[in-house]
């Protein structure tokens, strides 16, 4: 059992060709946040780094922004972007949180926003 | 197997900059998942947290050593390690440095190097 | 900070004994607790993390308990190669702090 706990933006749906923000937020524990890498499944979309500010994997540039804050946001969505999303806190002294979201792109334009949920 | 080895002058005159260098080999420094850390131990006595540095630069030291300490790190070498000013006789010590791990809650120091002497005198 | 207070600081045992060391911590540190072993002119090794997880490589005669303020270490059957200083240390919260160590000598 961690110290903090990880509230994110859960379940998710968005329309085809519209864009979403992906936030996650920790709370609970006074360690110091290094780094959050955003990644899909295994493959790393982003990282923002409090030292080095934000990089954006280059095959994700065209449709990840960065912000606002440490939350992420996808542009031009794709039925293909349906999935889970991770944001993993990389803090000193507790270690590595992660959060979980999941996103659905929606062909039709009844996409809703789930409520928000917390991760122990 | 990763290994950790302390480099540096074993001889510091009072009031001058204690210098070493923790190089890391057979694993990246710049791993996300991973800190790196001092340690000292005066002759005789018990451990001490100097500091932990992230590959990036964020660094988090004892306040007991106030501002004279900081670890900047080298990804390019590898490197990563530890300046200390204004020292005095009480900063003779073996120096360790070590990798905070394993990928678990609040991780302890998994790795360390074998310690480097240094003693303050004129 | 959090003090971390090792007792005894000192103890004589026998090959074969039951030995048990124990650490208190100032404030509660949930299971934030690891123990090592040093040799004289070595390094610090890692034996117990988070109160009771045994570090890869480490025999199963050690063993560790504990949670909020106070911690056990504990070696089941006392070998020749366990005589030496052991430190548990906190990682809880910054700053990170050692307790004074107990030095198993021969008896």
């Known amino acids: 059992m961690m110290t903090g706990t990880i509230e994110t933006t859960g379940n998710i749906s968005a329309e085809k060709g519209g864009s979403i923000i992906l936030q996650c937020h920790l709370s609970s524990t006074t360690a110091q946040v290094t780094q959050v890498n955003w990644e899909q499944q295994d493959q790393l979309l982003a990282i923002c780094n409090a030292d080095l500010g934000w990089h954006i994997s280059p095959s994700f540039k065209d449709r990840v922004a960065p912000g606002p804050g440490l939350g992420l946001t996808l542009q031009s969505l794709t039925v293909n972007d349906t999935g889970e999303y991770f944001c993993i806190y990389h803090t000193y002294p507790d270690g590595t949180y992660t959060g979980r979201i999941f996103l659905e792109v929606l062909e039709s334009s009844v996409a809703e926003h789930g409520a928000r949920f917390q991760i122990p | 197997q990763l290994q950790l080895q302390e480099s540096g002058p074993g001889l510091v005159k009072p009031a001058e900059t204690l210098s070493l260098t923790c190089t890391v080999s057979?694993?990246?420094?710049?791993?996300?998942?991973?800190?790196w850390t001092w340690i000292r131990q005066p002759p005789g006595k018990g451990l001490e947290w100097i500091g932990t540095v992230y590959y990036s630069g964020s660094t988090f030291h004892n306040p007991s050593l106030k501002s004279r300490v900081t670890i900047p790190v080298d990804t390019s070498k590898n490197q990563f390690s530890l300046k200390l000013s204004s020292v005095t006789a009480a900063d003779t010590a073996v120096y360790y440095c070590?990798?905070?791990?394993?990928?678990?809650?609040?991780?302890?120091?998994?790795?360390w190097g074998q310690g480097t002497l240094v003693t303050v005198s004129s | 900070d959090i003090q971390m207070t090792q007792s005894p600081s000192s103890l004589s045992a026998s090959v074969g004994d039951r030995v048990t060391i124990t650490c208190r911590a100032s404030q509660s540190i949930s299971s934030y607790l690891n123990w090592y072993q040093q040799k004289p002119g070595k390094a610090p090794k890692l034996l117990i993390y988070?109160?009771?997880s045994l570090q890869s490589g480490v025999p199963s005669r050690f063993s560790g308990s504990g949670s909020g303020t106070d911690f056990t270490l504990t070696i089941s059957s006392l070998q020749p190669e366990d005589f030496a200083t052991y430190y548990c240390q906190q990682s809880y919260s910054t700053p990170i702090t050692f307790g004074g160590g107990t030095k198993v000598e021969i008896k």
């Open positions: 057979g694993g990246s420094i710049s791993s996300y998942d991973h800190y």
């Open positions: 070590a990798r905070v791990g394993p990928d678990v809650s609040h991780p302890p120091f998994d790795y």
């Open positions: 988070a109160a009771s």
